[in-house]
């Protein structure tokens, strides 16, 4: 093999170790991770790199090709036997593309000084890397004092002549970062001070958090911050057909990783999440709210033929209350209650029934009692009026029984027991009720109120009256009690089936007090108020009939 001395005497000739190195090393070069954006990658530049070596006999470019015959830009320097080396290699201007912190990855080999004969005094095993910021693409400057040192680069692995013999090359990779940058771009410079180096590749990149869709929010490509510990808060935007309660945010770390998600987007009503997008609910399905995860089938007795439905339409004769959730089945009014029975106790009626066969699909069934008073002769019914009391109540009954009190005695009633539920008032259909006809028991009649005097003579008084307002049954007879005024303890009773009587054997020119009461099968009513009439004197004519006030 060619002597390494050839490297020094013929600096323009590529020594064997470089050729061996490249063939081995370039096969190991990997594609950049997705969170790294290359600003420069010497491996991928097809033409001239445009780098400058100063002095001219320092760094030299070795023109090699890889197995695909693509050019490989490799720079080497190996002036280890000469003192006071100060060889600079300047890159072309590199745009930082808005990044404030950049990374430089160097791949290089370095010769072990111990393996070089005679060069121990002058041989170095490090080189220096510098940068110079500039907005000017043509502002390359060779004044050393304008360059800022990034670091001294040393090799983790150096190689010896033995390695060369075995064709084993030890490729070093070193990464340094620079920041914060404040200008549009920069130059890099590599300073050799007497080492034997082959600079195989230079990759300059910045890190970004790559665009991502998370929780239905799109987060854009985000360049990492200048500070290695900085977390950048980034706002996401909701994907199509999605909304948010809490704006989505994530934090972009200096390493280009998304961290600490806050908030999220949700597919809006009528849409559901599928494969990171919001897809429309198809006909037959709906989604009422963004907070529901997926479209659901329309509940029973409802349908939708629309896409993106937020609710379903009730079938004919089915209804939904405003307070019913859209996930609830549409319902209908209940059927009529069944098997109604009554129990009459004088002027009270107890009704009992069993619930309707069809509740309409609802749990909120209650009952309403309609009361009608019917004339048995005319067959005409009218509302019962306010005097009837319902125990516990007339409407909103939850139990299947009710008691009506204060009914009229001996009266025909029709009670309609109606089943209702939460949608009964939405239905135009007929009321669903069961009817019960009852007749209340007879009771003692109410007092006679209307008494008229008839013919009055010196020894007799004729009276007539009307049936009580509330006979409470069939009037069997009337009882007429009368006595001479102030002689109450000495009274006479007359019974009559008619509404007229004549009291005889009375004293002339005397005042008599009359009270009348009626009797039904249930007994006597109370006596009427007192009516006073006076017989005529011995010589007077009998009086005409007139109503007593």
């Amino acid at each position: 093999p060619a002597s390494l001395a050839g490297c020094y005497s013929a600096p323009r000739r590529a020594p064997l170790w470089t050729c061996l190195l490249l063939c081995a090393a370039l096969r190991t070069l990997l594609a950049s991770p997705s969170n790294e954006v290359n600003l420069l990658d010497s491996r991928t530049v097809m033409g001239d790199l445009g780098w400058i070596a100063f002095p001219k006999n320092g760094w030299e470019e070795i023109g090699e090709v890889d197995e695909n015959y693509a050019p490989i830009h490799t720079y080497q320097v190996c002036k280890v036997m000469e003192q006071n080396q100060n060889n600079w290699l300047l890159t072309s201007w590199i745009s930082n593309e808005g990044a404030s912190r950049i990374f430089i990855e160097l791949k290089f080999t370095l010769r072990d000084c111990n393996s070089l004969p005679g060069g121990l005094g002058t041989c170095k095993e490090t080189f220096n890397m510098y940068y110079f910021e500039s907005d000017d693409q043509n502002g390359r400057n060779i004044k050393e004092n304008q360059y800022i040192k990034i670091d001294t680069i040393a090799a983790d692995e150096s190689f010896t002549e033995l390695d060369l013999g075995d064709r084993v090359m030890k490729l070093n990779t070193e990464v340094r970062d620079v920041g914060p940058l404040s200008k549009k771009g920069f130059y890099l410079a590599f300073q050799d001070v007497g080492a034997c180096i082959a600079l195989v590749s230079v990759r300059v990149y910045y890190k970004k958090c790559p665009s991502v869709v998370r929780h239905l929010a799109v987060f854009p490509d985000t360049i990492t911050g200048a500070d290695s510990s900085q977390l950048l808060e980034v706002s996401g935007s909701c994907v199509n057909h999605s909304v948010t309660d809490e704006p989505p945010k994530m934090h972009c770390s200096a390493e280009g990783e998304w961290l600490v998600p806050i908030g999220k987007c949700m597919c809006k009503a009528g849409y559901e999440e599928k494969n990171g997008t919001c897809q429309v609910c198809r006909p037959g399905f709906f989604k009422a709210s963004p907070h529901i995860q997926s479209c659901g089938k329309c509940p029973p007795h409802s349908y939708t033929h629309e896409e993106a439905s937020t609710s379903c339409v009730c079938e004919k004769d089915y209804f939904r209350r405003e307070s019913d959730p859209p996930t609830m089945a549409c319902t209908r009014p209940p059927s009529a209650p069944r098997n109604a029975i009554s129990n009459v106790n004088e002027t009270s009626v107890f009704l009992e029934w069993i619930p309707p066969a069809d509740t309409g699909g609802r749990k909120d069934v209650s009952y309403y009692i309609a009361c009608k008073k019917c004339n048995s002769h005319a067959g005409v019914c009218e509302e019962c009026g306010g005097h009837v009391r319902y125990l516990p109540r007339q409407s909103g009954l939850k139990n299947t029984s009710v008691m009506m009190v204060d009914l009229l005695a001996h009266t025909n009633y029709t009670f309609e027991i109606e089943a209702v539920n939460g949608v009964s008032d939405l239905s135009p259909g007929a009321r669903q009720y069961v009817s019960v006809n009852v007749t209340t028991n007879q009771a003692a009649p109410s007092p006679v109120t209307n008494v008229k005097k008839g013919k009055i003579a010196k020894n007799s008084i004729s009276l007539s009256w009307q049936e009580p307002d509330r006979p409470n049954g069939i009037i069997l007879e009337y009882e007429i009690k009368y006595f001479e005024k102030d002689q109450e303890t000495s009274y006479t009773i007359i019974k009559s089936k008619e509404t007229t009587i004549t009291a005889e054997g009375l004293k002339p020119a005397s005042v008599y007090v009359f009270q009348i009461r009626a009797r039904t099968a249930a007994g006597y009513g109370v006596f009427s108020r007192r009516f006073e009439f006076e017989t005529t004197p011995v010589f007077a004519a009998s009086s005409d009939q007139s109503q007593i006030p």
């Epitope: 033929h305 896409e307 079938e315």
Partner: antibody
Amino acid sequence: EVQLVESGGGLVQPGGSLKLSCAASGFTFSTFGIHWVRQAPGKGLEWVASISGASTTIYYADSVKGRFTISRDNSKNTLYLQMNSLRAEDTAVYYCARYGTSFPYGLDYWGQGTLVTVSS
Amino acid sequence: DIVMTQSPDSLAVSLGERATINCKSSQSVDYDGDSYMNWYQQKPGKAPKLLIYGASNLESGIPDRFSGSGSGTDFTLTISRLEPEDAASYYCQQSNEDPFTFGQGTKLEIK
């Protein structure tokens, strides 16, 4: 009672136009999707087009896309099919049919059909 | 488009016997656990009538001698005891995906 009655069919020359109507009654028209289906003489059924109740979703068979337009007027309870650039192969009985309410929906009520003849 | 293929194209069955019509779709017509497959009966000069929806649900008013089965791509319409009025053409239709394609039809005759 649900009823669908088609009208507007007749004889038309190739390249001509015709507008079919479908009058609906007996149901809440505006909440139902309606479809047009045709049947060439002696042949099977061919789905033509559909429209949702609110006209938000409209679909056409490839064979009529760009030539036929389905529309509806919910205030008149009427569905339409505007047929332009008619061809001989469009000759058929055209039925309108209602999308059903029992899931998954079929076409539960059909009109009696109206005959369209495309011939020179 | 989903292609629907019925078999046989025609069949003749004796009164009281069982008739079976098959329908195969070029891709699955299932979605979310339901089969979007419908069967229609059509008599000459009349509009089609829905018999079965969702592969196996009997439409209201249809005699229970009609039944449907199947899922995915393979479906069957069965008439358990043939009556004279069952002589007609029968069509399958998928409603899973637009266009809502029909099968070519099967003509059922009474032997």
